[in-house]
């Protein structure tokens, strides 16, 4: 009925597309909740989040585990007070995700 | 402060974060703009999308040019009347991105 | 000069919650950029992180210990607690907090021991 | 979890010999963007707390005498005593603050001969 070569081409591509961790790019200023004052340089960082497709729209792709990566940028406060600073930064890393029911919503909020 | 190396692979990690297409998985039926009783099997594929940082806040991530691929999927109608079909789709895959200033808000909307 | 000093109740019986703390001096726990973290060491010398608070408050635990440990802080007084519930003999370990600018632990209390039993 | 593997358990030296001691980790400890090994190195005397003497794989920390040497980069590391002194008895450990959980390896214990 379909040939053997398309299914198997069809269930490559839908594992590549399920719930895991996936390099993405994060903003560290809004991850780290800074002022608006404050920049990183560079803004972003390299990490694994939690991305993909779930078989069902009630399951969300959601972390399970996560780390937490050390990093050093440099941070710029405007007004340009004093030399730009290197420091520490510490960044969430997912390491294991899963397809969990999305949060019940309560009708007031 | 820094050596040469080290300030060469620092800038190729934030080349790595910057705006540029990147492989994201998309789910077809909201893609397509499909009613809920239209399903796809698998229900995401993987196509290239915009992503990344912009060095301003002003500034998004934005797609300048775009391919559409074909992809083979089965299509489901529910309730289930015939067999699942095997069925060509399109889908949008952005070839070029830029950092653009964000469209300006109505002061109403 | 940065000093850490932990304290405990020392013994504790199986089953027990222990509660420990420890008084920084020297320097606010509440300064950018250091995580304050608790260590312990069981008697066969190897070493186990237990977990940090944040400057700004943020905890993160060890998961092979999560469920049974809790971090706070008291800014006013300058310390850190680790809440450690349903005790077994195989906590029994010196515990040390040490603090962290990110890149390694540089200042580490003298550590107190914990003694569980019945 | 980064698992660290330090060898050998442990060694018995004489005042005057060079001193080696390894950790590797499970994965590497490189991080970017400022491409540095985020691993250290401590010594640990009878009844008291560790004290580091090298972070960032190679770096020493100040007061650290000179013979401490670290070196390596993404899962293996070394520590190097170039000279080894009556104090330096004590146990050594290596420890990853790549990734939460941070680990520490089992130990080095350095006895004299």
């Known amino acids: 009925f379909y040939d053997i070569e398309t299914l198997k081409v069809i269930d490559e591509e839908w594992q590549r597309t399920q719930c895991s961790p996936r390099e993405t790019c994060v903003e560290v200023a809004s991850e780290l909740g800074k002022s608006t004052n404050t920049f990183f340089k560079p803004p972003c960082v390299n990490v694994f989040r939690c991305g993909g497709c779930c078989n069902e729209e009630s399951l969300i792709c959601m972390n399970t585990s996560t780390s937490y990566i050390s990093k050093q940028l440099f941070e710029i406060s405007v007004p340009l007070t004093s030399v730009p600073e290197l420091v520490p930064v510490k960044v969430a890393n997912h390491t294991g995700c899963k397809c969990l029911p999305t949060a019940p919503r309560h009708p007031y909020s | 402060f820094y050596d040469i190396e080290t300030l060469k692979v620092i800038d190729e990690e934030w080349q790595r974060t910057q705006c540029s297409p990147r492989e994201t998985c998309v789910e077809v039926a909201s893609e397509l703009g499909k009613s809920t009783n239209t399903f796809f099997k698998p229900p995401c594929v993987n196509v290239f999308r915009c992503g990344g940082c912009c060095n301003e806040e002003s500034l998004i991530c934005m797609n300048t040019s775009t391919s559409y691929i074909s992809k083979q999927l089965f299509e489901i109608s529910v309730p289930l009347t015939s067999v699942p079909e095997l069925v060509p789709v399109k889908v949008a895959n952005h070839t070029g991105c830029k950092c653009l200033p964000t469209a300006p808000r109505h002061p109403y909307s | 000069d940065v000093q850490l000093q932990e304290s405990g109740p020392g013994l504790v019986k199986p089953s027990q919650t222990v509660s420990l703390t420890c008084t920084v001096t020297?320097?606010?726990?509440?300064?950018?950029?250091?995580?304050w973290n608790w260590i312990r060491q069981v008697s066969g010398n190897k070493l186990e992180w237990i977990g940090y608070?944040?400057?700004?408050?943020?905890?993160v635990s060890n998961p092979s210990l999560k469920s049974r440990i809790s971090i706070t802080r008291d800014t006013s007084k300058n310390q850190l607690f680790l809440q450690l519930n349903s005790v077994t003999t195989e906590d029994i370990a010196t515990y040390y907090c040490?603090?962290?600018?990110?890149?390694?632990?540089?200042?580490w209390g003298q550590g107190t021991t914990l003694t569980v039993s019945s | 979890d980064i698992v660290m593997t330090q060898s050998p358990s442990s060694l018995a030296m004489s005042v005057g010999q060079k001193v080696t001691m390894s950790c590797k980790s499970s994965?590497?400890?490189?991080?970017?963007?400022?491409?540095?090994?985020?691993l250290a190195w401590y010594q640990q005397k009878p009844g008291q707390s560790p004290k580091l003497l090298v972070y960032?794989?190679?770096t020493r920390e100040s007061g650290v005498p000179d013979r401490f040497i670290g070196s390596g980069s993404g899962t293996d590391f070394t520590l190097t005593i170039s000279s080894m002194q009556a104090e330096d008895l004590a146990l050594y450990y290596c420890?990853?603050?790549?990734?939460?959980?941070?680990?520490f390896g089992s130990g080095t214990k350095l006895e004299i001969k």
């Open positions: 608070i944040s400057y700004s408050g943020d905890t």
């Open positions: 420890q990853q603050h790549y990734s939460t959980p941070y680990t």
């Open positions: 020297g320097y606010s726990i509440t300064n950018r950029y250091h995580w």
């Open positions: 040490a603090r962290d600018g990110g890149i390694y632990f540089d200042y």
């Open positions: 960032f794989a190679s």
């Open positions: 994965q590497s400890l490189l991080s970017s963007p400022n491409q540095k090994n985020y």
